[in-house]
Amino acid sequence: EICGPGIDIRNDYQQLKRLENCTVIEGYLHILLISKAEDYRSYRFPKLTVITEYLLLFRVAGLESLGDLFPNLTVIRGWKLFYNYALVIFEMTNLKDIGLYNLRNITRGAIRIEKNADLCYLSTVDWSLILDAVSNNYIVGNKPPKECGDLCPGTMEEKPMCEKTTINNEYNYRCWTTNRCQKMCPSTCGKRACTENNECCHPECLGSCSAPDNDTACVACRHYYYAGVCVPACPPNTYRFEGWRCVDRDFCANILSAESSDSEGFVIHDGECMQECPSGFIRNGSQSMYCIPCEGPCPKVCEEEKKTKTIDSVTSAQMLQGCTIFKGNLLINIRRGNNIASELENFMGLIEVVTGYVKIRHSHALVSLSFLKNLRLILGEEQLEGNYSFYVLDNQNLQQLWDWDHRNLTIKAGKMYFAFNPKLCVSEIYRMEEVTGTKGRQSKGDINTRNNGERASCESDVLHFTSTTTSKNRIIITWHRYRPPDYRDLISFTVYYKEAPFKNVTEYDGQDACGSNSWNMVDVDLPPNKDVEPGILLHGLKPWTQYAVYVKAVTLTMVENDHIRGAKSEILYIRTNASVPSIPLDVLSASNSSSQLIVKWNPPSLPNGNLSYYIVRWQRQPQDGYLYRHNYCSKDKIPIRKYADGTIDIEEVTENPKTEVCGGEKGPCCACPKTEAEKQAEKEEAEYRKVFENFLHNSIFVPRPE
């Protein structure tokens, strides 16, 4: 029996009865917040073999092992994850072992086992046999291994029953509990699962099977389940669903889930029954079950009940996230804000069409309107008094409307009005008239030539770069010395630079009048020698990274025909040289036979160039005789924590303690102080723990149902 769409068992342990007939949980399983310690021995769910999403256990008092509850849980598919995890065991006060001795596969996601004060048998499980990558597993804050004394079956009697594998250079027995080994299939099966008798399953089986080489005898399917058979792909007229089974069109058409209730129903796309069309696709008609590609960004129509939407903060802009067509009028009134330009772009950057008018007034925080980076049409179906559909009034720092070289904007109906924008050059407004098709609509007073641009360098000369030199982390550039009509008016230069993976940046990107700026700025004084060209060495740059650079001349306010002259360069794109890559990450090695090692790693976080190959070096090491000195299988030899009469913990040590050697002196001394990198790593770790805990609490603490 398939149970779904996710089972949440909380407060009352008797709710576990809901799992009685489940063989597959299509969705997640939460068992949490059972504060009264109960006897779980009478609860056993041997039918449950698969959870398609994730398993979360949190604060369940009295539960000592999961093995009795779920003796046959074989696969957790991780189709949807809980904060990147498919198995979360958090603050389980009485859990002594995980005990899921039939768990063979976690298809996607990692595991997080944290703050379980009594939990042992963690180091005896080889998670690499269950998960593809163990590097993202997070196992901290549980019972210290030294206090556990984990013994696999038979080791006390010196008749070990479990198989051995290597984890972190430690070759050891693998088990779930004191009487349950971790199952491993014969190497002859390769990646295939196997039966209890070590016979290889059919390739389409996952985890285990009841009979060898039979696609109807699988405990779980590697790919998809349909009509009792594990299949590599869904048969004709059936569709993939929830990542594990095949369903027909009728089933898909009739799904009404709590998650999808507001949508128009599930769709069939690319052979899958899914909640919504994927990114880049839209329904082929409002009630259609099929998707077609969008031309450009997928349309999302947003409507304002009160006709006019006032954007006076990031919060109000947030309501427009994803909107491509705005039915109504936009009134932008941004007086202040932090990182406002990029926040507005994030939330309003997809708007293509405004059906009414756009009014920008008293927006002293804005330097540019480029945050409306996809606006291409203002219909002007509703206009302001005076028939204005684009109205720009009293914006003290507005310098740019849009980058007209890369912008097509049409104003279908209505006029434009500009007044009291002291840093907005009239030439910029005239350019907008041409691009938008409004030239000739405006009357004389609609674009005020005296109070627009009165405090801006509107007549700009072009500065030309003369040379560029690069190394792995430096750029040296020089440019022509600018000579204004009166040389005393030139004060200095400002160089602006930033990382630019693509050649599409503009001067006003991410810039606002409140101090946020995506550009780094460096002031460059005039060289005292008039014949030397000004230049700068930019250092501390990243290797193999493209930067955008431009230079502005800083001039005195020099009025000429009521306007200020200035000079700036075009934007120059320049890439630093390649360098040595950082070290490869997460290097893991394991032996799969007596003569082979398998080594895996992830690419370096900083390739610093185009990676072409890796070099793997190895050397034979002498066997460590220390491993043979003690019989670790006998209980009394395991170091047991004792408590001294004083306040210090003493651990029994079976050989001389190793002393730290600091600096050049050979002798015992205190541990070296932590490096900045270590301190930073610890800080990030603590932060990550907090973020996860907040996510957990926010996800599971919900108002009590009626």
Epitope: E1, I2, C3, G4, P5, G6, I7, D8, R18, N21, C22, G27, F251, A253, N254, I255, L256, S257, A258, E259, S260, S261, E264, G265, S286, Q287, P705, E706
Partner: antibody, heavy 117, light 112 residues
Framework: QVQLQESGPGLVKPSETLSLTCTVS?????????WNWIRQPPGKGLEWMGY???????NYKPSLKDRITISRDTSKNQFSLKLSSVTAADTAVYYC??????????WGQGTLVTVSS | DIVMTQSPLSLPVTPGEPASISCRSS???????????LQWYLQKPGQSPQLLIY???NRLYGVPDRFSGSGSGTDFTLKISRVEAEDVGVYYC?????????FGQGTKVEIK
């Protein structure tokens, strides 16, 4: 895989309240769908009575509105029908059924309730 | 309430012959979203109803292709191209477009 099972007394006295419970297995009633009660008087046609949705909202047939209550117990994954002031005209086979976006896809096997003194 | 009227109420048929059941609604059952939520159910003796057709003409996966549905607005028809013995039972049309949802009074199909 989804199963619905009606339960409750087979005999109710006139003017009393008829109470039935539908136990759902294989799907959480809070996870989605509309959970309905439908009845069929002996030898007659089907009559839709009302539903409770996955989020707990109700919809009832107007002619029954004053007498009907459909509620749920999410911890037991059950939903219930209460019909007050019953008369002989309420004698019927009562079905619980699940309705999705388009149709009824799962039905209980039905339970006969007789109203008689 | 929307009244669903079926005809005939009784339909004796010969195996292998075609059969047709009509269902009329007292007003249009086109939903505001453009869909028409009209279904046909078959109730065999002693069983719960089972779905045959949804949204006027969509045959449920696994239902024999001798069953077909058609119609629009207020007039709908269920056709069986060649009746078989297993098709006996009471056929109900049902509208789920407007609350309260309503069933037709049923058409009893029996073998002559």
């Amino acid at each position: 895989q989804v199963q619905l099972q009606e339960s409750g007394p087979g005999l109710v006295k006139p003017s009393e309240t008829l109470s039935l419970t539908c136990t759902v297995s294989g799907y959480s009633i809070t996870g989605g769908y509309l959970w309905n009660w439908i009845r069929q008087p002996p030898g007659k046609g089907l009559e839709w009575m009302g539903y409770i949705s996955y989020d707990g909202t109700n919809n009832y047939k107007p002619s029954l509105k004053d007498r009907i209550t459909i509620s749920r117990d999410t911890s037991k994954n059950q939903f219930s029908l209460k019909l007050s002031s019953v008369t002989a005209a309420d004698t019927a086979v009562y079905y619980c059924a699940r309705y999705g976006r388009v149709f009824f896809d799962y039905w209980g096997q039905g339970t006969l309730v007789t109203v008689s003194s | 309430d929307i009244v669903m009227t079926q005809s005939p109420l009784s339909l004796p048929v010969t195996p292998g012959e075609p059969a047709s059941i009509s269902c009329r609604s007292s007003q249009s059952i086109v939903h505001s979203n453009g869909n028409t939520y009209l279904q046909w159910y078959l109730q065999k003796p002693g069983q719960s109803p089972q779905l045959l057709i949804y949204k006027v003409s969509n045959r449920l996966y696994g239902v024999p292709d001798r069953f077909s549905g058609s119609g629009s607005g207020t007039d709908f028809t269920l056709k069986i191209s060649r009746v078989e013995a297993e098709d006996v039972g009471v056929y109900y049309c049902f509208q789920g477009s407007h609350v309260p949802w309503t069933f037709g009074q049923g058409t009893k199909v029996e073998i002559k």
